[in-house]
Interface confidence: medium
Amino acid sequence: FERTRSLQDPCSNCPAGTFCDNNRNQICSPCPPNSFSSAGGQRTCDICRQCKGVFRTRKECSSTSNAECDCTPGFHCLGAGCSMCEQDCKQGQELTKKGCKDCCFGTFNDQKRGICRPWTNCSLDGKSVLVNGTKERDVVCGPSPADLSPGASSVTPPAPAREPGHSPQ
């Protein structure tokens, strides 16, 4: 690494992956192992995140970018940058402080994560319930009773919703 020549700030020429080493006359030195600098002109390198325990490494740390973690099977990420791993539940359940609990009557969860949410109220749209809801599935709304006739077409159940309110992994 060559010594920088900038008159304003000799550190400004140090690229990502290096730091401006004051102990070595402001030479651009490579980041030490297990550290990184994602932008140029840094006076220190940041320590790499370590993915331990329930976290597993999704992307290794490099000299220019931090490690990225996700969660081991049976857990899912929460929060910005997967700051927390939280256990999965079964469909028809949601996670509470005391573990996985079944959805209350009138609510459902079709995912292994997220929350129990109320069944759709078909009558609000002037429709009738074609298929009853369960803990795992929303109701399926069909035509209003007046619209039902021998030639009426069947209703395709809606696709499951995305996992509500959780960080994508």
């Epitope: 927390m84 402080k97 609510t107 929350i115 809606p158 995305r162 309110g165």
Partner: antibody, heavy 120, light 110 residues
């Protein structure tokens, strides 16, 4: 950079209508609830309701049901809060916030707030 | 629906420790989250889940809970910690994912 940017301050007269907005960027808008929170002058935070873009379902605080409409346009990553007939008591700062649920309820990012003033 | 109760105000000497409480039936089932709000600013998430701090939140903030009560502790309070603090959780008395806020606690640093 993840952020929620709200529309600017509004001054309205009682009986007028209003729609304020909250644009999300830097994340997958469809995967998170967007909530609206009211803060009247000198008072605390009140949850008004929220919208889940993944299936377009809205949940309201019973105190606000019928008073406001919460909606969103997923194509432009924007949520809305609207009134058909404002009252002086609607004067407040309104925040949008991104919510996620787990064994609790967390608002991890907030808009800067929109001040709505209703006065004759 | 249920509610979350906070003490309206507490004061703490600079560098000392203060504990803010939040009480409510929903906290038996769900974790609380905590927010700091300074005048003219939006709230900021301080703590969520089982004592999880978002990045950028100083480690002098910590959270614990016991039964139907959640606690936010500021250890070694700084002048910049003077603010309103709100707790938040889900409502257990409804089959909708309703949200509760406490009334807020004003923390004064002496």
């Amino acid at each position: 950079q993840m952020q929620l940017v709200q529309s600017g301050a509004e001054v309205k007269k009682p009986g007028e209508s209003l729609k304020i907005s909250c644009k999300g960027s830097g994340y997958n808008f469809t995967n998170y609830f967007i909530a609206w929170v009211r803060q009247m002058p000198g008072k605390g935070l009140e949850w008004m309701g929220m919208f889940y873009p993944g299936d377009s379902k809205t949940t309201y605080n019973p105190s606000f049901q019928g008073q406001v409409i919460i909606s969103a346009d997923k194509s432009i990553n924007t949520a809305y809060l609207q009134w058909s007939s404002l009252k002086a008591s609607d004067t407040a700062v309104y925040y949008c916030a991104r919510a996620f649920y787990a064994a609790g309820n967390y608002f991890d990012y907030w808009g800067q707030g929109t001040l709505v003033t209703v006065s004759s | 629906s249920s509610e979350l109760t906070q003490d309206p105000a507490v004061s703490v000497a600079l560098g000392q420790t203060v504990r803010i409480t939040c009480q409510g039936d929903s906290l038996r089932r769900y974790y609380a989250s905590w927010y700091q709000q300074k005048p003219g600013q939006a709230p900021r998430l301080l703590m969520y889940g089982k004592n999880i701090r978002p990045s950028g939140i100083p480690d002098r903030f910590s959270g614990t809970d016991s039964g139907n009560t959640a606690f936010l502790t500021i250890t070694g309070a700084q002048a910049e910690d003077e603010a309103d603090y709100y707790c938040n959780s889900r409502d257990t008395n409804a089959n909708q994912p309703l949200v509760l806020f406490g009334g807020g606690t004003k923390v004064t640093v002496l």
